[in-house]
């Protein structure tokens, strides 16, 4: 999906009002310095591409993020503010529902959510020069 046509300010508002809090809740008990940010993004469409990938694509050691509250709210925000986004998600979501397993918060998932927090922070500051 090409995130170029999303309404970035409205997605930012959704992040600030609720998604950010859910990410913090997920990470509660974890030190903010515990993980190094290794994933970066250069502009808002790129940030959303990376956010979608980390949130919804299962990775080795962390297959369970897509059903977390922050993930479902992210999905809702993208469906509302990115024209045509929801149509691209239908097959993926149906496949995901079939293989839903017991929720386990692994260290790998915590690291991944830490990366997500960094991507969202970068998304919210699009005018900053890339480090």
């Amino acid at each position: 999906y090409d995130f170029t046509n999303c309404d970035f300010e409205k997605i930012k508002a959704a992040y600030l009002s609720t998604i950010s809090k859910d990410l913090i809740t997920y990470m509660s008990g974890t030190k903010s310095t515990e993980f190094n940010n290794t994933v970066s993004c250069s502009n808002r469409p790129h940030c959303l591409t990376e956010i979608q990938s980390l949130t919804f694509n299962p990775t080795a050691g962390c297959a369970s993020l897509a059903k977390e509250m922050f993930a479902m709210k992210t999905k809702a925000a993208l469906a509302i503010w990115c024209p045509g986004y929801s149509e691209t998600q239908i097959n993926a979501t149906q496949a995901m529902k079939k293989r839903r397993k017991r929720k386990v918060t692994t260290n790998k998932c915590l690291e991944q959510v830490s990366q997500l927090q960094g991507l969202w922070r970068r998304f919210n500051r699009p005018l900053l020069k890339q480090q």
Epitope: L16, S17, T18, K73, K75, A76, I80, T93
Partner: antibody, heavy 113, light 108 residues
């Protein structure tokens, strides 16, 4: 085909609360993408609020709470401190591409002493 | 807060005639964030037009939307018996996402 099924009609006393549910089925769906709209008898549509982003119409601030349970694909709208003017049909509707694409059948809430 | 004002309040027309409904916003609304709905008595509203001019799935092409800025129009090119209903515009530009007060299209 997305379907939104709402809970049944309610009769409430002034000062009490009501909680209306909206269960979704079919399609790719997040119950966080639900907004609530009400319609008083013979009146127009009035947007109440939604979760993404988390905001409510000013007139309902402090009285309305909108929540969702993804595990059951259900959204909820709770309205407290009910008064007779809250007598209305309450609709849930799924937001998509900045419009309310799918609607529930409506739940009539009557506030009467 | 963006206020939407619809006019006329009631439109009395015959089947086959053209209906032109207006929705005026108190502030600029991005065309992406203007929608039109139809509501018949005892039924939930139904989305007709989103993004000011895009027809929702299954909506006949006699319905069309146009406009930008603060002035938007819903046109029904040739009224069918089932088109007599109340029509609402709604903005998604800024919260609260208000509706207009509605235009009733009735049979003359």
């Amino acid at each position: 085909q997305v379907q939104l099924v709402q809970s049944g009609a309610e009769v409430k006393k002034p000062g009490s609360s009501v909680k209306v549910s909206c269960k979704a089925s079919g399609g790719s769906f997040s119950s966080y993408a639900i907004s609530w709209v009400r319609q008083a008898p013979g009146q127009g549509l009035e947007w109440m609020g939604g979760i993404i982003p988390m905001n409510y119409a000013q007139k309902f601030q402090g009285r309305v709470t909108i929540t969702a349970d993804e595990s059951t694909s259900t959204a909820y709208m709770e309205l407290s401190s009910l008064r007779s003017e809250d007598t209305a049909v309450y609709y849930c509707a799924r937001q998509l591409a900045a419009a309310l694409v799918y609607w529930g059948q409506g739940t009539l809430v009557t506030v009467s002493s | 807060e963006i206020v939407l004002t619809q006019s006329p309040g009631t439109l009395s027309l015959s089947p086959g005639e053209r209906a032109t409904l207006s929705c005026r916003a108190s502030q600029n609304v991005n065309t992406r964030y203007l929608a039109w709905y139809q509501q018949k008595p005892g039924q939930a509203p139904r989305l007709l037009i989103y993004a000011a001019s895009s027809r929702a799935t299954g909506i006949p092409d006699r319905f069309s939307g146009s406009g930008s800025g603060t002035d938007f129009t819903l046109t029904i090119s040739s009224l069918e018996p089932e088109d007599f209903a109340v029509y609402y515009c709604q903005q998604y530009e800024s919260s609260p996402y208000n509706f207009g007060q509605g235009t009733k299209v009735e049979i003359k």
